[in-house]
């Protein structure tokens, strides 16, 4: 199994562009995550989906951020427009 | 029927602390994310703070980071603003608020903030 | 600080008029949210995502707008419409609001 597939590994970007992180869950997982990791605040959940439906995205309530999930193998998080204290580590995880 | 209501203002002194609640029902706080936002008397409406429903995403406004400390108890279904060295310019009303919708779609009726001596 | 303002800060018409209030931000914003308040209530949740109406409004209310310059419009006055109306943003926070529009009985 490959594991959670997240692209890009590396992103820059120039403040106000947006950005979109993709992510591919494992295959038969019905949960998905996106969390942000910086040094001032640690890990942050931002969003979770259970069976592709956004169950809790209080983590992100800057509306500069969305998130889909449009079928149980994929989902993107968007940041519109992006801004220098977005850069940070971002992680999709999944679960049964 | 979703209920917000906020408690624990009342008169302080300059410098002093007050710790206000809101006491939520009628829907799962667990799963929303919760703002407080005053308003001073014959003012507008300003925002004070956010937190995530699992209380690791928190935002506050600038003037008052330092000062003013959000939290939250899941298990009793509460939101909390801890607020020290208190100024004659934080007497407002205080309210507590639902993130739904991408903004604030409940509110509680308020909590009075007097700050003087 | 992305900063809203609004236009007008005072504003008196009459039952089944048509009024429309603007509100600017500083900086671009993604969508403009919108909320009615009472004297001595809290304030209620209007308009969210810049044009859609909250569970249980009015569908004389609308809401519109991109960019810097959004706009709340009542298409025909009703005398419970009489309150103060603010917009804000969460596009960055601190999720600023704007000062306000008092909307008055001529």
């Known amino acids: 199994d490959a594991g959670v597939i997240q692209s890009p590994r590396h992103e820059v970007t120039e403040m106000g562009q947006e950005v979109t992180l993709r992510c591919k869950p494992i295959s038969g997982h019905n949960s998905l995550f996106w969390y942000r990791q910086t040094m001032m605040r640690g890990l942050e959940l931002l969003i979770y989906f259970n069976n592709n439906v956004p169950i809790d995205d209080s983590g992100m309530p800057e509306d500069r951020f969305s998130a889909k999930m449009p079928n149980a193998s994929f989902s993107t998080l968007k940041i519109q427009p992006s801004e220098p204290r977005d850069s940070a580590v971002y992680f999709c995880a999944s679960s049964l | 029927e979703v209920q917000l209501v906020e408690s624990g203002g009342g008169l302080v002194q300059p410098g002093g602390s007050l710790r206000l609640s809101c006491a939520a029902s009628?829907?799962?706080?667990?799963?929303?994310?919760m703002h407080w936002v005053r308003q001073a008397p014959g003012k507008g409406l300003e925002w004070v703070s956010y937190?995530?429903?699992?209380?690791?995403?928190?935002y506050y406004a600038d003037t008052l980071k330092g000062r003013f400390t959000i939290s939250r108890d899941n298990s009793k279904n509460t939101l909390y603003l801890q607020m020290n060295s208190l100024r004659a310019e934080d007497t407002a009303v205080y309210y507590c608020?639902?993130?739904?919708?991408?903004?604030?779609?409940?509110w509680g009726q308020g909590t009075t903030v007097t700050v003087s001596s | 600080d992305n900063q809203l303002t609004q236009s007008p800060s005072f504003l008196s018409a009459s039952v089944g008029d048509r009024v429309t209030i603007t509100c600017r931000a500083s900086?671009?914003?993604?969508?403009i949210y919108w909320y009615q308040q009472k004297p001595g209530k809290a304030p209620k949740l209007l308009i969210y995502?810049?044009?859609n109406l909250a569970p249980g409004v009015p569908s004389r209310f609308s809401g519109s707008g991109s960019g810097n310059e959004y706009t709340l419009t009542i298409s025909s006055l009703q005398p419970e419409d009489f309150a103060t109306y603010y917009c804000?943003?969460?596009?960055?926070?601190?999720?600023?609001f704007g000062q306000g529009t008092k909307l008055e009985i001529k």
């Open positions: 608020a639902r993130r739904g919708e991408g903004a604030m779609d409940y």
């Open positions: 009628g829907f799962t706080f667990s799963n929303f994310g």
């Open positions: 937190i995530s429903s699992g209380s690791k995403t928190i």
């Open positions: 900086s671009s914003v993604n969508y």
């Open positions: 995502y810049t044009s």
């Open positions: 804000q943003q969460f596009t960055s926070s601190p999720f600023t």
